[in-house]
Interface confidence: low
């Protein structure tokens, strides 16, 4: 049994059509409005799951539902990356995957979704209310981040309802990078709105039906609840964060690491060789265990699905926390 908390993606509002029958000319404007509102605001979903074992392990899954190509995914805990959060893993579609204790088995599930396993227990395990965040950098949308956590009262083995506490945040790059193609449409929309301002405008209503998924995903998290914006990040006790994450990476990482955009330049502690393979197909994901990687050519771990606990030695920094008895 497992405890789950899902943060479903925010679904774009569907224009209400009531009262619009006699105003067919408003259909296009409202379609444009929807596009203008949702353009550049791709959806990100986060699912946090805790396995019910003494040596509890957490599985974090994140997906990007935008239309752009993903250039980097950063997973952190304790808050957003760069805002008090600690980087757990960075996944690059071509450069490979890098992870830091207690992260394990970070991998691509599809070209737009990833999963990550955290080993944990004892002093090094994540607390039940730990916030996990996934940040997707894509072109042309920019960077988008969503966060999720287990319900505070979750007990291993008890099913928990989805947590409607996502945080979607567009970096400046995302805001500025919004496709300019719709600019004209937005201007035109404003023009039409001014022309029709004497007419009643249909209300925008949140969809209460099954949300539309912009893209297919390997598995679809239930959309049991609409996610709300601007939910404050949960704070976590320092005791819930592995001390191994407090040490700066002494080597500086691979050469390409330094050339990453600043939003991804938060260097996690502990080294791990980067796999230089392109996005592997399902079933052959390159995983950089917490730190056991030696030279890139020495560890061929192609990971499949599976859970791992904190202290799984994974390469150069496999020092996750131990499996302490709770």
């Amino acid at each position: 049994m497992r405890t789950e908390a899902q943060v479903p993606a925010l679904q774009p509002p569907e224009p209400g059509l009531e009262g619009a029958m006699g105003h067919r000319t408003l259909v296009l404007p409202w379609v444009l409005l929807t596009l203008c509102v949702t353009a550049g605001t791709p959806e990100v979903w986060v699912q946090v799951r805790m396995e019910a074992t003494e040596l509890s392990s957490f599985t974090i899954r994140c997906g990007f539902l935008g239309s752009g190509s993903i250039s980097l995914v950063t997973v952190s805990w304790g808050g957003p990356n760069g805002a008090g959060g600690t980087t757990l893993a960075v996944l690059h579609p071509e450069r490979g995957i890098r992870q830091w204790a207690p992260a394990r088995q970070a991998r691509w599930e599809t070209q737009s979704s990833i999963s990550l396993i955290l080993e944990g227990s004892g002093a090094s395990s994540p607390c039940a209310n730990t916030t996990f965040c996934c940040k997707f950098a894509s072109f042309p949308e920019g960077s988008w981040e969503a966060c999720g956590s287990l319900p505070p009262s979750s007990d291993p083995g008890l099913s928990a309802p989805p947590t409607p506490a996502p945080i979607l945040r567009a970096d400046l790059a995302g805001i500025l990078g919004v496709s300019g193609v719709l600019l004209f449409g937005c201007v035109y929309l404003l023009h039409l709105l001014r022309r029709h301002k004497h007419r009643p405008a249909p209300r925008l209503q949140p969809s209460r039906t099954s949300p539309q998924a912009p893209r297919a995903r390997a598995w679809a998290p239930s959309q049991a609840s609409q996610a709300a914006l601007h939910v404050p990040y949960a704070t976590i006790n320092t005791s819930c964060r592995p001390a191994t994450l407090d040490t700066a990476h002494p080597h500086g990482g691979p050469s390409w690491w330094a050339s990453l955009p600043t939003h991804a330049a938060h260097r996690p502690q502990g080294p791990a060789a980067w796999a230089s393979t392109p996005i592997p197909a399902r079933g052959s994901f390159v995983s950089v265990e917490n730190g056991l990687y030696a030279q890139a050519g020495e560890r061929p771990p192609h990971t499949g699905p599976g859970l791992t606990l904190f202290p799984d030695p994974r390469g150069p920094r496999a020092m996750e926390g131990p499996l302490g008895v709770r």
Epitope: Q105, T244, A248, Q269, E289, T303, T308, L309, R314, M319
Partner: antibody, heavy 114, light 107 residues
Framework: QVQLKESGPGLVAPSQSLSITCTVS????????VNWIRQPPGKGLEWLGV???????DYNSALKSRLSISKDNSKSQVFLKMNSLQTDDTARYFC????????WGQGTAVTVSS | NIVMTQSPKSMSMSVGERVTLNCTAS??????VSWYQQKPEQSPKLLIY???NRYTGVPDRFTGSGSATDFTLTISSVQAEDLGDYHC?????????FGSGTKLEIE
């Protein structure tokens, strides 16, 4: 309660193979990596390799050509196989869970002798 | 391979004394160092992980410190039951390596 228990042949003839099983309880092999470590009599510890929850393995490069680690998640067992044993492979072999090696088995003594 | 060098090789202390064990890594291992206690005829037990994190159930007289290449395990007031071998190990890079151990005897 987390427990690991190694079981092996005890005595192995030179050039023969060694097979040891580590049976675990209290946690799932799907979620944790298991390391193999050995300790020659009166000496220090030597890390042999690890098998991760996802089945991936990493080995000590000095022994990689002779080592093989596998597991059966359903039986909660991890297997170590080492080929071409020599007398200097005589040691107590331990399995331990996680990279920090939080829990260790009691070890199984292996003597390589003709 | 990263070489972990422990000192001293052995030491004899009286109950109540402060004990300091040292471990030096041949290269930077960040904070990925653990300390293990191995009593005679027993398997090692994790005491400290991540340089300074006391493992579950470990008495607070055991303290770990250090960074990069130099690490220390301190027993603030050694007890008779603390006798045995103490190993340091690094899980920063493959292969994981251990020090040769320090034997602690209680007078």
């Amino acid at each position: 309660q987390v427990q690991l228990k190694e079981s092996g042949p005890g005595l192995v003839a030179p050039s023969q193979s060694l097979s040891i099983t580590c049976t675990v309880s209290g946690f799932s092999l799907i979620g944790h990596g298991v390391n193999w470590i050995r300790q020659p009599p009166g000496k220090g510890l030597e890390w042999l390799g690890v098998i991760w929850g996802d089945g991936n393995t990493d080995y000590n490069s000095a022994l990689k050509s002779r080592l093989s680690i596998s597991k059966d998640n359903s039986k909660s067992q991890v297997f170590l196989k080492m080929n071409s044993l020599q007398t200097d492979d005589t040691a107590r072999y331990f399995c331990a869970v996680n990279s920090a090696m939080d829990y260790w088995g009691q070890g199984t003594a292996v003597t390589v002798s003709s | 391979n990263i070489v972990m060098t422990q000192s001293p090789k052995s030491m004899s202390m009286s109950v109540g004394e402060r004990v300091t064990l040292n471990c030096t890594a041949s290269e930077n291992v960040a904070s990925f160092v653990s300390w293990y206690q191995q009593k005679p005829e027993q398997s090692p037990k994790l005491l400290i992980y991540g340089t300074s994190n006391r493992y579950t159930g470990v008495p607070d007289r055991f303290t770990g410190s250090g960074s990069a290449t130099d690490f220390t395990l301190t027993i603030s007031s050694v007890q008779a039951e603390d006798l045995g071998d103490y190993h340091c190990g690094q899980s920063y890079n493959y292969p994981f390596t251990f020090g040769s151990g320090t034997k602690l005897e209680i007078e």
